[in-house]
Interface confidence: medium
């Protein structure tokens, strides 16, 4: 025998109190699959969470974070604060990048400055907490008649020190 509840579509639940009739989900609840015996309570986006997608009878609400925060965890279950450029977020809060490292974004970790000498180049512009160094031409290119300037080396991936 087929379970009568299997006929209940998403957005409804199989109501045992009413002879297993398919009843619509009550307000602020949803069922995303058919055959459900209960509807799930909609997620509420409060405080630093804001609503990205409203709850419907067939899908949960989706949250993101208010300005100054960014999502962390599955389905944006947490909001982590942004830091300023030149800082990184540790478990104890934002802290300035150490000398020799930089962060040009409001999140992520401080990364080491590019080591120009590894590519045989000189430092054209010194690095700061917010910006990587800019590598210039190699010393050999600075001989009379050489005028081209090599574009800066790409920034290293987070967490990788120069080899």
């Amino acid at each position: 025998l087929q379970d009568p509840c299997s006929n209940c579509p998403a957005g409804t639940f199989c109501d045992n109190n009413r002879n297993q009739i398919c009843s619509p989900c009550p307000p602020n609840s949803f069922s995303s699959a058919g055959g459900q015996r209960t509807c799930d309570i909609c997620r509420q986006c409060k405080g630093v969470f804001r609503t990205r997608k409203e709850c419907s009878s067939t899908s949960n609400a989706e949250c993101d974070c208010t300005p100054g925060f960014h999502c962390l965890g599955a389905g944006c279950s947490m909001c982590e604060q942004d830091c300023k450029q030149g800082q990184e977020l540790t478990k104890k809060g934002c802290k300035d990048c150490c000398f020799g490292t930089f962060n040009d974004q409001k999140r992520g970790i401080c990364r080491p400055w590019t080591n120009c000498s590894l590519d045989g180049k000189s430092v054209l512009v010194n690095g700061t907490k917010e910006r990587d160094v800019v590598c210039g031409p190699s010393p050999a290119d600075l001989s009379p008649g050489a005028s081209s300037v090599t574009p800066p080396a790409p920034a290293r991936e987070p967490g990788h020190s120069p080899q």
């Epitope: 962390l72 104890k92 970790i109 987070p158 967490g159």
Partner: nanobody, 124 residues
Framework: EVQLVESGGGLVQPGGSLRLSCAAS????????MTWVRQAPEKGLEWVST????????YYADSVKGRFTISRDSSKNTLYLQMNSLRAEDSAVYFC?????????????????WGQGTTVTVSS
């Protein structure tokens, strides 16, 4: 599948106690540091405490030091947070998290798995 499931949250009066549990599965529990963090509705994520994989080193946020105790039982694959002398400002959703290494990292980037959270409300 690596999974963390928190439990033990609830409503408690100021000055009361609660013990949160985090049941871990899908990985070698004793090989990784574990962390508790919390998120209050109006605030960003706040780190609470971390314990090393071996359980011999613990770290606490200043706001909970002396009131909260983190511990782990590798035979039960469970992480605990004993919370005493609770205050209204401790109200939050508490998440447990698995670190990527046996020793604690200063960063959330060291965290590779999060639980779904358990709600603690401190109110009279």
């Amino acid at each position: 599948e690596v999974q963390l499931v928190e439990s033990g949250g609830g409503l408690v009066q100021p000055g009361g106690s609660l013990r949160l549990s985090c049941a871990a599965s899908g990985f070698t529990f004793s090989s990784f540091a574990m962390t508790w963090v919390r998120q209050a509705p109006e605030k960003g994520l706040e780190w609470v405490s971390t314990i090393s994989g071996s359980g011999d080193t613990t770290y606490y946020a200043d706001s909970v030091k002396g009131r909260f105790t983190i511990s782990r039982d590798s035979s039960k694959n469970t992480l605990y947070l004993q919370m005493n002398s609770l205050r209204a400002e401790d109200s939050a959703v508490y998440f447990c998290a698995k670190e990527a290494t046996a020793m604690a990292s200063d960063y959330y980037y060291g965290v590779d798995v999060w639980g779904q959270g358990t709600t603690v409300t401190v109110s009279s």
